[in-house]
């Protein structure tokens, strides 16, 4: 994400088009309180961060309110008056959507439709991952809206599901972050379960007459 400038590595995360977090890792300045200066308009004066993140007692990042912005963040990380990293970035290219809310499951025979509240902005993928104890890895299906139908399930098996949201790479690029996963929920025969057995129970032997 952020290449080195005087040994400074930066990371930007734009949480759900609400809050921007810029963090830095500067080995050369590891015991220094670097300051963060920013503006959203190239013609304005820089403001200094009022909400610093601290690591081992020294500044390591800044949190900014940036509600529903699709503009450029101009920023400068400084050691006193000396800029050690200066850049401007389109914030949306560092989007991390919020975790899916109001996840619901609607069962119909060997299929389940997973729905949740769509986020207020677009160009997202809603991904459902699922597995049974018989599966060696998670299966995945994704759609452009939070309405994902998974077919071909075995009604007798217990399945674990979780959901997340991803920014479409074609639009937002490779520097975004998927949302955190929703809580895992387990289902069997259309009913919610506390958990799925980690190891599948072997089939009961048929008793010979």
């Amino acid at each position: 994400q952020g290449g080195a400038a005087e040994g400074v590595q930066i990371q930007i995360i734009y949480f759900n088009l609400e809050t921007v977090q810029v963090t830095w890792n500067a080995s050369k300045y590891s015991r220094t309180n670097l300051t963060f200066h920013y503006r959203f308009n190239g013609d304005e004066a820089y403001d200094q961060c009022t909400n610093y993140l601290l690591q081992e007692g020294h500044t390591s990042g800044c949190l900014l309110d940036a509600e529903q912005r699709d503009d450029i963040l101009y920023f400068s990380i400084r050691n006193g008056t000396h800029p050690v990293f200066t850049a401007s970035r389109w914030m949306v290219y560092y989007l991390k959507p919020s975790s899916p809310k109001h996840v619901r499951f609607s069962w119909h025979q060997d299929a389940v439709t997973v729905t949740c509240s769509d986020l207020s902005y677009g160009d997202l993928l809603y991904e459902v991952q699922y597995r049974s104890p018989f599966d060696t890895e998670w299966q995945s299906k994704q759609e452009n809206t939070c309405n994902v139908t998974i077919e071909g399930l075995d009604a007798e098996k217990c399945y674990s599901f979780w959901v997340r949201v991803k920014a479409m790479e074609d639009v937002y690029g490779p520097d975004t972050y998927p949302s955190d996963w929703s809580e895992v929920t387990c289902w069997q025969r259309g009913e919610i379960r506390d958990a799925c057995a980690e190891t599948p129970t072997p089939p009961k032997p048929k008793l010979s007459k």
């Epitope: 952020g2 290449g3 080195a4 400038a5 005087e6 190239g42 912005r69 699709d70 503009d71 450029i72 101009y74 990293f85 200066t86 850049a87 401007s88 389109w90 949306v92 677009g122 160009d123 639009v171 690029g173």
Partner: antibody, heavy 118, light 107 residues
Framework: EVQLLESGGNLVQPGGSLRLSCAAS????????MTWGRQAPGKGLEWVST????????YYADSVKGRFTISRDNSKNTLYLQMNSLRAEDTAVYYC????WGKGFDIWGQGTMVTVSS | DIQLTQSPSFLSASVGDRVTITCRAS??????LAWYQQKPGKAPKLLIY???TLQSGVPSRFSGSGSGTEFTLTISSLQPEDFATYYC?????????FGGGTKVEIK
């Protein structure tokens, strides 16, 4: 096919106005940052203006600030550049371009020629 | 504004030659550098972005390297269709700025 097609270039007198259009096709226009650039005859490339995907944020080169206005109509898949108080030094081929994640301009139109002369 | 200095500004080479063009930035720009090819009367074409990532559809004989202030575009084996003008562009800090160009001509 992803395509940008500029129009509106012409011969105009100093102090005059012109409106350039850029019609986009083959991609979801309203999802992308868009840019105007230009190239004076025999010279290099120069960035002119950029607009965010929603149209809510605009950026201009110092040389055109206060004279040029970039805008877009996402329902018509069209980008515009309104050019006022034109000067001889604005004579150039004007290109519209699509932004690639803030790391380059990956699709360019064929260009439209603007000549400012009396 | 960040200045980009390209060198050489003019280059004479033969088909099959290995060609290297340099772009120097007046201050650190991380890896926010793009390279374009432009032929006479045509629009620029993106070759490389993020200093070293090849744009889809661009032949693999083109490569980019560098970070910070010094960058290079290399054409491993020059082809007849590669004779053109090449520009670097920084996008680390607005306004985006271009280098002055390098014209590659046939020897």
């Amino acid at each position: 096919e992803v395509q940008l097609l500029e129009s509106g270039g012409n011969l105009v007198q100093p102090g005059g106005s012109l409106r350039l259009s850029c019609a986009a096709s083959g991609f979801t226009f309203g999802s992308y940052v868009m840019t105007w650039g230009r190239q004076a005859p025999g010279k290099g490339l120069e960035w002119v203006s950029t607009i965010s995907a929603s149209g809510g944020s605009t950026y201009y080169a110092d040389s055109v600030k206060g004279r040029f206005t970039i805008s877009r109509d996402n329902s018509k898949n069209t980008l515009y550049l309104q050019m006022n108080s034109l000067r001889a030094e604005d004579t150039a081929v004007y290109y519209c371009a699509k932004d690639k994640w803030g790391k380059g301009f990956d699709i360019w139109g064929q260009g439209t020629m603007v000549t400012v002369s009396s | 504004d960040i200045q980009l200095t390209q060198s050489p500004s003019f280059l004479s080479a033969s088909v099959g030659d290995r060609v290297t063009i340099t772009c120097r930035a007046s201050q650190g720009i991380s890896s926010y550098l793009a390279w374009y090819q432009q032929k006479p009367g045509k629009a620029p074409k993106l070759l490389i972005y993020a200093a070293s990532t090849l744009q889809s559809g661009v032949p693999s004989r083109f490569s980019g390297s560098g970070s910070g202030t010094e960058f290079t575009l290399t054409i491993s084996s020059l082809q007849p269709e590669d004779f053109a003008t090449y520009y670097c562009q920084q996008l680390n800090s607005y306004p985006p700025t271009f280098g002055g160009g390098t014209k590659v001509e046939i020897k």
